[in-house]
């Protein structure tokens, strides 16, 4: 498999058949598949060097692994997008052997002197062809030469098989399955041959190809493949329930932010709630996690403005649940990214010198910002797309707080909507779905560069759109939701999470 280790070294060779028998639309589809693969790999924060070859009668090398920009995923994608099927029109035979020889030449070193560390680089060849080579001879011989060059399969004690993976995608109207199978790697419990039909669900294909065991602690990563559970798709999501004898129970959501902490809303708890009465589950697991302590933001005080006629005041409505035992990260349990951390700098593929202010401008620009939250409906977790009103619609969004029960007598809405809040909901630019009571404490998320970054904590809403456990379809335009802006509680987050190795900027 493709081992995605941010500290490892890898070369990926993309080889695309542009011969007559492929056809223009299949060629375009294959290109799109490779673009998606480059993006998927880049989303892990790994920077392999890419080689890019198209071929028919002759190969054409578009990107050499030795080029300075070969590890710049955006630049390689640009080169790939600029390739046309017509580029091989004049000489449109199929010489797969010559194409693989071009790969061999990129792998080999000058004067046959291996450079220091050559044996630590993993090599991946992704060949997209119909297998109908009609000139140049059998391409399998070049695969053997490559194996020789990389000293694979020679030493029984150290066969080095995981340093070469050859994946073959069958593209085109007619595919010679025998030829394709012969070229691909053969490894136990791994799939190295894919058909056109597979390419309709690329996440499924990538799931078969990628080994992410070295990057399970990466924040904001998800798997969207069809066999995945709700928690593959939102592995940070935590369900919180507070049992109060003789008062029933309160349900909330939260987000895993580190191996020991879940971030949620302070209002989910009262000062009387004991740790043992708080149940937290993650990854869709049945068992509850043991709680060590709940840490409230020191400025949170729901009764803080009672004298001023404000029955409930949600400023600084955030809390961290510290777990007794360390979480074991896996594909269904992993953290979400937090603002102003090194993890988010890497997730957004920003320079290491990026400041907190620059992250803020990237994630919360002064405009409508596409975001999402996760809600549970009929025992299923579903993503709801909303827009954070952070530009010209911000004022009207915040003013609608006056329609919330108990806030109708508030003269100045900034008394309840402080600078700590983000506002979603309403009907412009689109009709936003609203949060329900049980969504409280869950993350408000920005999805960027294939990663998920939490920018807010769901706090309160103007209208209860979920009476009788059913989300109403028709809701008034003033149905707004308010979320604590994580950029506005950073000092607290940084202090409480200072031992969690998140690299707060």
């Amino acid at each position: 498999k493709i081992v995605l280790d941010p500290s490892g070294s890898m070369n990926i060779y993309l080889v695309l058949d542009g011969s007559d028998s492929i056809g223009a639309s299949n060629f375009t589809g294959a290109k799109k598949c490779l673009v998606n693969l480059i993006e998927k790999v880049a989303s892990y924060g790994v920077k392999p060097r890419y080689g890019l070859v198209t071929y028919a009668t002759y190969p054409k090398i578009w990107v050499k692994v030795s080029e300075a920009d070969s590890s710049n995923a955006d630049w390689v994608t640009k080169q790939l997008n600029e390739i046309n099927y017509e580029d091989h029109k004049l000489k449109s035979g199929t010489n797969t052997k010559k194409a693989l020889q071009a790969v061999y030449s990129m792998m080999s070193w000058p004067d046959d002197v291996p450079p220091e560390g050559w044996n630590r680089t993993r090599h991946v060849i992704i060949l997209m062809t119909d297998g109908l080579h009609n000139m140049g001879g059998d391409p399998i011989t070049v695969i053997d030469e490559i194996r020789d060059l990389l000293y694979i399969g020679k030493d029984r004690k150290n066969p080095r098989e995981d340093y070469l993976d050859v994946y073959v995608f069958g593209v085109g109207p007619l595919v010679n399955q025998v030829n394709i199978n012969a070229l691909a790697s053969k490894k136990d419990n791994e799939q190295h041959v894919f058909k056109v039909k597979d390419m309709e669900n690329l996440e499924d294909v990538f799931y078969q190809m990628i080994d992410e065991s070295q990057s399970l602690s990466l924040c904001g990563m998800v798997w969207e493949h069809r066999k995945g559970t709700d928690y593959h798709k939102q592995p940070w999501q935590a369900k919180i329930s507070v049992i109060r004898p003789s008062k029933g129970h309160e349900s909330c959501m939260g987000a895993v932010v580190s191996e020991y902490f879940v971030l949620t809303a302070a209002h989910c708890f009262t000062v009387d709630d004991k740790e043992h009465s708080i149940k937290v589950s993650v990854g869709g697991e049945k068992r509850d996690l043991e709680i060590e302590v709940v840490l409230f933001h020191p400025n949170y005080n729901i009764n803080g403005k009672k004298e001023a006629g404000i029955p409930e005041f949600y400023d600084y409505d955030v809390a961290l649940i510290k777990l007794k035992n360390k979480l074991k990260y896996g594909q269904t349990i992993r953290p979400i990214c937090l603002p102003c951390t090194e993890g988010t700098t890497r997730a957004l593929r920003l320079p290491p010198t990026t400041t907190c202010q620059q992250q803020k401008e990237e994630l919360l620009p002064a405009q409508d910002i596409k975001a999402l939250f996760v809600s549970e409906e009929e025992k299923k977790l579903t993503r709801k797309e909303v827009y954070i009103k952070n530009g010209d619609k911000k004022g009207s969004c915040e003013r609608d707080a006056q329609y919330a029960p108990g806030y109708d007598k508030v003269k100045d809405i900034s008394e309840v909507v402080t600078p700590r809040f983000l506002c979603t909901g309403g009907v412009s630019p689109y009709a936003d779905p609203n949060t329900c009571r049980g969504d409280s404490g869950g993350p408000l998320i920005v999805h960027k560069r294939s990663r998920f970054i939490q920018v807010g904590v769901i706090s309160w809403g103007v209208v209860d759109v979920c009476k009788n456990q059913k989300r109403q379809k028709q809701v008034p335009a003033h149905a707004r939701d308010f979320h604590i802006n994580l950029f506005q509680v950073l000092p607290w987050l940084k202090e409480k999470l200072q031992d969690e190795d998140l690299g707060f900027l």
């Epitope: 400041t355 907190c356 202010q357 803020k360 950029f487 506005q488 202090e495 200072q498 690299g503 900027l505």
Partner: antibody, heavy 121, light 92 residues
């Protein structure tokens, strides 16, 4: 440009309450990412961070101190205050007010010239 | 004209979150270096910082008479923020 100026009583008797004011200009304490802190230096000794207050009204204190001070602010008048109740001779020091940009990669960018406090009976 | 290096050792790793300050004899304090090696604006380039993990240093190349001062390191990694005891620099 950024300036900070501390003011205080100069002399106090033991058990009295110390009230210090930092008046600043050139920035606003409601600007994202900015904070103001207090640092003290007993005569001939090193520097000790006491407390900080951030743009969002978060307050942080040095947990190693015997008696916790109280920090507060008046954003509209560009002032930050520090109170230490029941002072003793160990609180004799020069008290500095500093501007702090948020973030681990930052230092105390700008310092006031300090105000001297003597605690004596 | 000399070159001087002042060392600062932390009791645990501080991820390069280390700053250097200069306190002149009249008591005024200035930030010189932040985040181990970044020069604060307006500070002469003869000041430089380096280090990692627990060991850090401030180097002044080409000493000038106005460099007579006490130099403090300060960790910005974890609360409470703490300062080193200070190193007094005198010129012979």
């Amino acid at each position: 440009q950024v300036t900070l100026k501390e003011s205080g009583p100069g002399i106090l008797q033991p058990s009295q309450t110390l009230s210090l004011t930092c008046s600043f200009s050139g920035f606003s304490l409601s600007t994202f990412g900015l904070g103001v802190g207090w640092i003290r230096q007993p005569s001939g000794k090193g520097l000790e961070w006491l407390a900080s207050i951030w743009w969002n009204d978060d307050k942080y204190y040095n947990s190693d101190l015997k008696r916790r001070p109280t920090i507060s602010r008046d954003t509209s008048n560009s002032q930050v205050f520090l109170k230490i109740s029941s002072v003793d001779t160990a609180d004799t020091a020069t008290y500095f007010c500093v501007q702090i940009p948020y973030g681990s990669r930052n230092g105390f960018d700008y310092w006031g010239q300090g105000t001297s406090l003597t605690v004596s009976s | 004209g000399d070159r001087v290096t002042i060392s600062c050792s932390a009791s645990q790793g501080i991820n390069n979150y280390l700053n250097w300050y200069q306190q002149k004899p009249d008591g005024t304090v200035k930030l010189l270096i932040y985040y181990t090696s970044s020069l604060h604006s307006g500070v002469p380039s003869r000041f430089s910082g380096s280090g990692s993990g627990t060991d850090y240093s401030l180097t002044i190349s080409n000493l000038e008479p106005e460099d007579v001062a006490t130099y403090y390191c300060q960790q910005h990694s974890k609360l409470p923020w703490t300062f080193g005891g200070g190193t007094k620099l005198e010129i012979k």
